[in-house]
């Protein structure tokens, strides 16, 4: 009796089970009355990453340098490439297909989370008691400058996006 | 539909390489596998080699040393090549496809000066 | 290189008769998949061989339902359950789980 359904790792074919090729290997010829099934190795920059009954090996991805990509991961014939982006750009998507430059923090506001090759510059506001006087991908909300502990006292107020300016205490008093 | 045929040269001298083709029709040979059988007169059946879909060779340990199997899968051909002929090789050569039960019709070659 | 041991050599069967072949391997013919490549082949007078059974007791498509195969790692069994005219000639095993393949001697059945 021909079999409806096959074991894990098996397909069904001209009412027979034939094994599938293990991963890093293409099908050549389906499992016969005589034979087992016959496979191949993928060729050089081609991987098959599953258990499979594909006739083709699916191409390594490209890392494109023109779009900013480089070799994050090397792939073999069991695996894919994976890129990402050169420094100070990061990916536009999960597939990571081109990158774009990291945004900086406007004055005002610090960096939140620094980017990845996979994720863009986190930005926040900087808080009352906190100032960012540049445009940059890397720098944090800066706390103003402590006046008290100098010995000096405030003579211009603290912005978001200017420290405070301190000055000698009035000595008339 | 599926077919298969040998062509030899019917008689061959003694010494001489034989050169027998198979042409196949229906199928692929980049697909499929095909393997060579030969039975002398009047005696069983010899396996003698066969070409894998891959383009591997595999044959039979006694006629190894004198026998070459190849392909041109463009052409849907296989071809044997076996040197050093001796009156032993006196057969039907078939070709047959490594599934169901596809056979060529056969062709005879005799070795004889 | 494995050897297939046909026996008997000569087979002669009244019709209508059972009748019955012995196919010993010298090695065992499971493959590490678990098939076990052993086939057999009945080669009328003048005609090319014809596939009867594949992987030991699976009939090719065609073949009538009184030939049967059995057994498993070195010893094997064609059966005829019951011998028609038609059946006469040459009956071959065959295997094709080691490389190199290879064919028994053949046992030749006739009628009584």
């Known amino acids: 009796e021909p079999p409806t359904a096959c074991r894990e790792k098996q397909y069904l074919i001209n009412s027979q089970c034939c094994s599938l090729c293990q991963p890093g290997q293409k099908l050549v010829s389906d499992c016969t009355e005589f034979t087992e099934t016959e496979c191949l190795p993928c060729g050089e920059s081609e991987f098959l990453d599953t258990w499979n009954r594909e006739t083709h090996c699916h191409q390594h991805k490209y890392c494109d340098p023109n779009l900013g990509l480089r070799v994050q991961q090397k792939g073999t014939s069991e695996t894919d490439t994976i890129c990402t982006c050169e420094e100070g750009w990061h990916c536009t998507s999960e597939a990571c297909e081109s990158c774009v430059l990291h945004r900086s923090c406007s004055p005002g506001f610090g960096v939140k989370q620094i980017a990845t090759g996979v994720s863009d510059t986190i930005c926040e506001p900087c808080p009352v008691g906190f100032f960012s006087n540049v445009s940059s991908a890397f720098e944090k909300c800066h706390p103003w400058t402590s006046c008290e502990t100098k010995d000096l006292v405030v003579q211009q107020a603290g912005t978001n996006k200017t420290d405070v300016v301190c000055g000698p205490q009035d000595r008339l008093r | 539909q599926v077919q298969l045929q040998e062509s030899g040269p019917g008689l061959v001298k003694p010494s001489e390489t034989l050169s027998i083709t198979c042409t196949v029709s229906?199928?692929?040979?980049?697909?499929?596998?095909v393997y060579w059988v030969r039975q002398p007169p009047g005696k069983g059946l010899e396996w003698m080699g066969m070409?894998?879909?891959?383009?591997?060779?595999d044959y039979s340990t006694s006629l190894k040393s004198r026998l070459t199997i190849s392909k041109d899968t463009s052409k849907s051909q296989v071809s044997l090549k076996m040197s050093s002929l001796t009156a032993a090789d006196t057969a039907v050569y078939y070709c047959?496809?490594?599934?169901?039960?596809?056979w060529g019709q056969g062709t005879l070659v005799t070795v004889s000066s | 290189e494995l050897q297939l041991t046909q026996s008997p050599l000569s087979l002669p069967v009244t019709l209508g008769q059972p009748a019955s072949i012995s196919c010993r391997s010298s090695?065992?013919?499971?493959?590490?998949?678990?098939?076990?490549?052993l086939h057999w082949y009945l080669q009328r007078p003048g005609q090319s061989p014809r596939l009867l059974i594949y992987?030991?007791?699976n009939r090719f498509s065609g073949v009538p339902d009184r030939f049967s195969g059995s057994g498993s790692g070195t010893d094997f069994t064609l059966k005829i359950s019951r011998v028609e005219a038609e059946d006469v000639g040459v009956y071959y095993c065959?295997?094709?789980?080691?490389?190199?393949?290879?064919f028994g001697g053949g046992t030749k059945l006739e009628i009584k």
């Open positions: 070409m894998w879909g891959g383009g591997s060779t």
């Open positions: 090695q065992s013919l499971a493959s590490s998949s678990g098939n076990t490549y």
């Open positions: 065959s295997q094709s789980t080691h490389v190199p393949w290879t």
């Open positions: 992987k030991v007791s």
């Open positions: 229906g199928f692929s040979l980049s697909r499929y596998s």
């Open positions: 047959v496809r490594t599934d169901g039960d596809y």
